[in-house]
């Protein structure tokens, strides 16, 4: 499955939109930094079959979409930017879903992939727990926004590596 060129442009647009969503000075939030334990090893792309990588990417985008689709998120961010960001993520999900269906027919995805997907889910659980503990404060959202920008960058890099393998 070849992800369309528009997919990588969508990635870039999503990152730009997320960068624009900041509402307060990040400098006031330094003390709120937190270790969310991003599962980097799931995004290095070396030990994966293509089908596995695509399903992990899908989970990453799906969880990001869910996080920014909550009522608390709507209250935190400027609405038009949030809607554009969600639209970009939704389009990426569609692209990846088409690929997942195609690739799973080609390769039998081993159980190891379930561990990778679980690692991504647990990562987002930690993010949600942090937001809850911080009572969804503006600084907590800023820290999460920075974290998601970082994790989406990892996703983008994995997608680039997948395209090079094609």
């Amino acid at each position: 499955c070849d992800l369309p060129q528009t997919h990588s442009l969508g990635n870039r647009r999503a990152l730009i939109l997320l960068a624009q969503m900041g509402r307060i000075s990040h400098f006031s939030c330094l003390k709120d930094r937190h270790d969310f334990g991003f599962p980097e090893e799931e995004f290095d792309g070396h030990q994966f079959q293509k089908a596995q990588a695509i399903s992990v990417l899908h989970e990453m985008i799906q969880q990001t979409f869910n996080l920014f689709s909550t009522e608390d998120s709507s209250a935190a961010w400027e609405q038009s930017l949030l809607e554009k960001f969600s639209t970009e993520l939704y389009q990426q999900l569609n692209d990846l879903e088409a690929c997942v269906i195609q690739e799973v027919g080609v390769e039998e995805t081993p159980l190891m992939n379930e561990d990778s997907i679980l690692a991504v889910r647990k990562y987002f659980q930690r993010i949600t727990l942090y937001l809850t503990e911080k009572k969804y404060s503006p600084c907590a959202w800023e820290v999460v926004r920075a974290e998601i920008m970082r994790s989406l960058s990892f996703s983008t890099n994995l997608q680039k590596r997948l395209r090079r393998k094609d």
């Epitope: 960068a19 000075s25 990040h26 400098f27 709120d32 930094r33 937190h34 974290e147």
Partner: antibody, heavy 121, light 107 residues
């Protein structure tokens, strides 16, 4: 390979203006903040201020607020430190360093080689 | 501002010695504490971040410990290349502040 390359040594007279630079390469320049640190001859390290190149937001140490200006041009991955009117007491080595911002990652993990500024009449 | 106080300000030691440098913050900084090494004419180099995490490429003889207000940098077996000045720095809040430095000299 991540690198921060600073502009060369400067010799200036009191009252003159100066702008020194720090060019980042080998990483996404807008994903990290750039901090500036002063080291006067034979002395310790003093944090001056920081910039987020993605939006040019800045924060200064109270000791340096109003004394210097920090700026950045993300199109050329370069941060700047400038003085409008130098004093003899500005004579020092100035370092730029990369900061991960709000991400949980090492602070000031890469440093420039330093720019020696000498102010003398 | 958070004040950082290092001790001692200088020490003399021999190759192979175990060296300990302490850093005290004027208020709790949890684990937002970094250690740097600086050699004459060179830029500082990050050794330890978040109080106890060893920076990539730094020899394992360097270790950091502590939380709250009291922190320690330990060099388990001093090597010739370790003679330098060491700085602690808090990264909890702005303004970021450094300790005054500890110079490790050859005995």
């Amino acid at each position: 390979e991540v690198q921060l390359v600073q502009s060369g040594a400067e010799v200036k007279k009191p009252g003159e203006s100066l702008k020194i630079s720090c060019k980042g390469s080998g990483y996404s320049f807008t994903s990290y903040w750039i901090g500036w640190v002063r080291q006067m001859p034979g002395k310790g390290l003093e944090w001056m201020g920081i910039i987020d190149p993605s939006d040019s937001d800045t924060a200064y140490s109270p000791s340096f607020q109003g004394q210097v200006t920090i700026s950045a041009d993300k199109s050329i991955s370069t941060a700047y430190l400038q003085w409008s009117s130098l004093k003899a007491s500005d004579t020092a080595m100035y370092y730029c360093a990369r900061h991960p911002g709000l991400n949980w990652a090492p602070d000031f993990d890469y440093w420039g080689q330093g720019t020696l500024v000498t102010v003398s009449s | 501002d958070i004040q950082m106080t290092q001790s001692p300000s200088s020490l003399s030691a021999s190759v192979g010695d175990r060296v300990t440098i302490t850093c005290r913050a004027s208020q709790s900084i949890t684990n937002f504490l970094n250690w740097y090494q600086q050699k004459p004419g060179k830029a500082p180099k990050l050794l330890i971040y978040f109080a106890s995490s060893l920076q990539s490429g730094v020899p394992s003889r360097f270790s950091g410990s502590g939380s709250g207000t009291d922190f320690t940098l330990t060099i388990s077996s001093l090597q010739p290349e370790d003679f330098a000045t060491y700085y602690c720095q808090q990264s909890l809040d702005f303004p970021l502040t450094f300790g005054q430095g500890t110079k490790v000299e050859i005995k």
